[in-house]
């Protein structure tokens, strides 16, 4: 399933249009509708961002929220993997990183959150309208899935609002129940908005809650406020996929991640300054796919799953018995 | 080439435990995934849980809680299960399995099977 | 837990004939794999991700479908081909398996 809502980053207006009180009054809504929007809690956010000085170039940064050690993560365009989507990049915490053109470097970023470059120029080089997706996978637990765009008009150069772009897959089990709480709020949200819809409404104001502010974010509802929408699951058409990626298969047979520090897919490429990287705001987060059960064990902290030989805490001594990686 | 070396036979009374394991090799240990079923005469597969080598951290199937427990011998880079309190239908050939995280989690390796029979 | 439900329970075919099986969700999974077993052998991979192939395996394996309804098609049956099929889900915890498909030779 996929859904849309476009919900704008909103501003309250300011302090001197309205007494306090009309200022609550409208503040109120506004935070009760991004608890309806976001309730349950999102599980993986995407980020999807051109760069002003390479128009051609994108950068996709995904994160999984979720407590769960990930065990494999997938970006595509074009719409979901396995759903017309065409693989991009596969990130392994051990086997180590496979990418495929136009993909110039995909990178964990923390234990939990990835990103991926890409280029490229006529045939290959993404276009705005590009759907991109990334896929976090925690076995068994299940695989959450999120989606994001850069909306058609985004200018690199400008410092446009954030474009909610949300494409939100809701097809499998273990939806969450909307508390009775939120449910609560919704409708008294409703009930405001009915009072209000004689004034004027607040101002569109860029978010500045990201540090990065970023030229475009892609987000979405979380899938327990989305359960009831039932809506058509349909692909994002893009004219600039190219054709060359359609053989582009990363489960090409178990040998291409051989061993850590021989193969090719797994050259070490220095650690990722996990522990700076700026986590986006809130209103970027992409809902999930599907939020299951109970993880079995976290993964000890590192710098490069798969990319550092002795990411175990206690160091190279960790290597002596069979257990060395991750 | 990838094999997973399951212990041999056993035969145990009823409320007694057994401890059974997989020895993989042919591959890095710590990089799959390694579930355990069980498979009752002429019936289908049942899933009891899944630990990864790298950390020992299992995950079961709720049904098989407090009956199985997985562990991860370092020493010889073997996977265990234990089986306790047992009963006639815990008489089962019990499987390990390696998963592939590159091939949507499918068991691409299976050991030969360990055949536990449970009788007084 | 999500059940799968194989059917038909048991079938038989001549060789060259095609064969198909299916296998029915309760509740929609991502993926399904196809295990092979002969008798008194361990379950073998036929099929992952719904429809790629296993090294190994011929080409006349297939596999198809998404949501709750997913498919086997052997496209021209083979003596070596009589065993029971499995269907197997990772969508949710626990994992769960079909109750399998005997396929036998006429």
């Known amino acids: 399933m996929r859904t849309e809502a476009q919900v704008p980053a909103l501003q309250p207006p300011e302090p001197g249009l309205e007494g306090a009180m009309g200022h609550r009054t409208l503040v109120l809504p506004w935070v009760l509708l991004t608890l309806c929007v976001t309730a349950g809690t999102p599980e993986v956010w995407v980020q999807v961002r051109m760069e002003a000085t390479e128009l051609s170039s994108f950068t996709i940064r995904c994160g999984f929220l979720g407590s769960g050690s990930i065990s494999l993560v997938t970006v595509s365009w074009g719409g979901p993997n396995g759903a017309g989507g065409t693989t991009l990049a596969v990130l392994h915490p051990e086997r180590g990183i496979r990418q495929w053109a136009p993909a110039r470097q995909a990178r964990w970023e923390t234990q939990s959150s990835i990103s991926l470059i890409l280029e490229g120029s006529g045939a290959s080089s993404p276009c705005a309208n590009t759907t991109f997706c990334c896929k976090f996978a925690s076995f068994p637990e299940g695989s959450w899935e999120a989606c994001g765009s850069l909306p058609p008009s985004s200018d690199p150069g400008l410092s446009a609002p954030p474009t909610p772009a949300p494409i939100l897959r809701a097809d499998l089990a273990g939806i969450l129940g909307v508390s009775g709480v939120l449910l609560f709020g919704c409708v008294y949200l409703l009930h405001l908005l009915r009072r209000h819809k004689h004034r004027p409404a607040p101002r569109l104001q860029p978010s500045r809650t990201s540090p990065q502010a970023p030229r475009a974010r892609a987000w979405a509802p979380s899938q327990a406020s989305q359960a009831a929408l039932h809506v058509p699951y349909a692909t994002i058409n893009t004219s600039c996929r190219p054709a060359t990626l359609d053989t582009a298969h990363p489960h090409g047979g178990p040998s291409w991640w051989a061993s850590l520090p021989t193969h090719a897919a797994h050259r070490p490429q220095g650690p990722a300054a996990w522990a700076s990287t700026p986590i986006p705001a809130r209103g970027s987060f992409v809902s999930v796919e599907n939020g299951l059960y109970a993880q079995a064990g976290e993964r000890p902290p590192h710098t490069g799953p798969g990319l550092t030989l002795f990411p175990d805490p206690r160091g190279p001594r960790a290597m002596e018995g069979p257990l060395g990686v991750r | 080439e990838v094999q997973l070396q399951q212990s041999g036979p056993v035969l145990v009374k009823p409320g007694a435990s057994v401890k059974m394991s997989c020895e993989p090799s042919?591959?890095?240990?710590?990089?799959?995934?390694v579930n355990w079923m069980r498979q009752s005469h002429g019936k289908s597969l049942e899933w009891i849980g899944v630990i990864k080598p790298y950390n020992g951290a299992p995950s079961y199937n709720q049904k098989f809680k407090g009956k199985a427990t997985l562990t991860v011998d370092k020493s010889s880079s073997k996977i265990n299960m234990e089986l306790n309190s047992l009963t006639s239908e815990d008489s089962a050939v019990y499987y390990c399995a390696r998963s592939d995280d590159f091939d949507g989690y499918a068991m691409d390796y299976w050991g030969q099977g360990t055949s536990v029979t449970v009788s007084s | 837990q999500i059940v799968l439900t194989q059917s038909p329970a048991i079938m038989f075919a001549s060789p060259g004939e095609k064969v198909t099986m299916t296998c029915s969700a309760s509740s929609s999974v991502s993926y399904m794999h196809w295990y092979q077993q002969k008798s008194g052998t361990s379950p073998k991979r036929c099929i992952s991700?719904?429809?790629k192939l296993a090294s190994g395996v011929p080409a006349r394996f297939s596999g198809s479908g998404s949501g709750t309804s997913y498919s086997l098609t052997i496209s021209s049956m083979e003596a070596e081909d009589a065993a029971t099929y499995y269907c197997q889900q990772w969508t949710s915890n626990p994992l769960t398996f079909g109750s399998g498909t005997k396929l036998e030779l006429k």
């Open positions: 991700d719904t429809s």
């Open positions: 042919g591959y890095t240990f710590t990089h799959y995934y």
